[in-house]
């Protein structure tokens, strides 16, 4: 059995342009004033980190600045949004969710979102 | 200050029944997973039993060696968890802690297994 | 279930060494690991958490790291207090699984 319920879709289309959104929920045990959220790529049986953020329950979620993430949260939901997403970025993206303050220490894995890109097809020549 | 103080150890017969308790405090019990693990010189530590909390309807889980046999139970009013522990074995023998999540630990309370 | 392998299972070093204790997980376990001191005669101490976040009240000397399959520990600058047996333990699927422990000594 895995440790703390963390749900999110199934499966998601990006936009034509490279923009994907899901939420991720989790089940808190606990009142947890310290939430970290890390998105994960998995493909073939490689797992990296796409992006992470640790937010303070009540405040906005702060990615890196060079991040291709962005998000909200509203109580145990997390709104992720992925920007620059290409063909040969489509793959599961699991969320991770920790709860890191006060004790204890409570972390839940998602089953993964599978994300379709799609490239969009240049536009054709015009002859004036 | 948190404390956790197990008690209810001691020397058992094989086959026969014990009853391991746990009190807490310093710590909002009611937030807790609360678990048993055990301490044996040939085992190192190992992970006995847990107990969720009410958002998880008070789930419990057991590690293959003690299912069927042994039962976890709390009662938040008393910021108490439980272990009732069926037909011991002399491979049930070591020191049982008390966890909240796995950040706090008891004392521990031994129980021996022996005719 | 998750087997932990850790290693070594025993180690000796001088004060003012640095020693690294890794552990091995049969899966990716996402990073759900806990590291933690167990002295003689006392209770098992919760020093590291979810791979890398160091518990209240333990020495900034010890570090944790990995993901996927492999974490390791860290101590730094080593005491005569760090004498003890370390554990790892897969944190995110029951059965909660320990390594073997590591025996650290003093030379």
């Known amino acids: 059995c895995k440790a703390m319920h963390v749900a999110q879709p199934a499966v998601v289309l990006a936009s034509s342009r490279g923009i994907a959104s899901f939420v991720c929920e989790y089940a808190s045990p606990g009142k947890a004033t310290e939430v970290r959220v890390t998105v994960l790529r998995q493909a073939d049986s490689q797992v990296t980190e796409v992006c992470a953020a640790t937010y303070m329950m009540g405040n906005e979620l702060t990615f890196l600045d060079d991040s291709i993430c962005t998000g909200t949260s509203s109580g145990n939901q997390v709104n992720l949004t992925i920007q620059g997403l290409r063909a040969m970025d489509t793959g599961l993206y699991i969320c991770k969710v920790e709860l890191m303050y006060p004790p204890p220490y409570y972390l839940g894995i998602g089953n993964g979102t599978q994300i379709y890109v799609i490239d969009p097809e240049p536009c054709p020549d015009s002859d004036f | 200050e948190v404390k956790l103080d197990e008690t209810g150890g001691g020397l058992v017969q094989p086959g026969r029944p014990i009853k391991l308790s746990c009190v807490a405090s310093?710590?909002?019990?009611?937030?807790?997973?609360m678990n048993w693990v055990r301490q044996s010189p040939e085992k190192g530590l190992e992970w006995v039993a847990q107990?969720?909390?009410?958002?998880?309807?008070?789930?419990?889980y057991y590690s293959d060696s003690v299912k069927g046999r042994f039962t976890i139970s709390r009662d938040d009013s008393k910021s108490s968890v439980y272990l009732q522990m069926n037909n011991l074995r002399t491979k049930d023998m070591g020191i049982y802690y008390c966890?909240?999540?796995?950040?706090?630990w008891g004392q521990g309370t031994l129980v021996t297994v022996s005719a | 279930d998750i087997q932990m392998t850790q290693s070594p299972p025993s180690l000796s070093a001088s004060v003012g060494e640095t020693v690294t204790i890794t552990c091995g997980a049969s899966?990716?376990?996402?990073?759900?690991l806990n590291w933690y001191q167990r002295k003689q005669g006392k209770s098992p101490q919760l020093l590291i958490y979810?791979?890398?976040n160091l518990a209240d009240g333990m020495s900034s000397r010890f570090s944790g790291s990995g993901s996927g399959r492999q974490y390791s520990l860290k101590i730094s600058r080593l005491h005569p207090d760090d004498v003890a047996t370390y554990y790892c333990?897969?944190?995110?699927?029951?059965?909660?699984?320990f390594g073997g422990g590591t025996k650290l000594e003093i030379k």
């Open positions: 107990i969720r909390n009410k958002p998880y309807n008070y789930e419990t």
């Open positions: 333990q897969n944190v995110l699927n029951t059965p909660y699984t």
């Open positions: 966890t909240g999540g796995f950040t706090y």
């Open positions: 979810g791979a890398t």
């Open positions: 310093g710590f909002t019990f009611s937030d807790n997973w």
């Open positions: 899966e990716n376990i996402y990073g759900g």
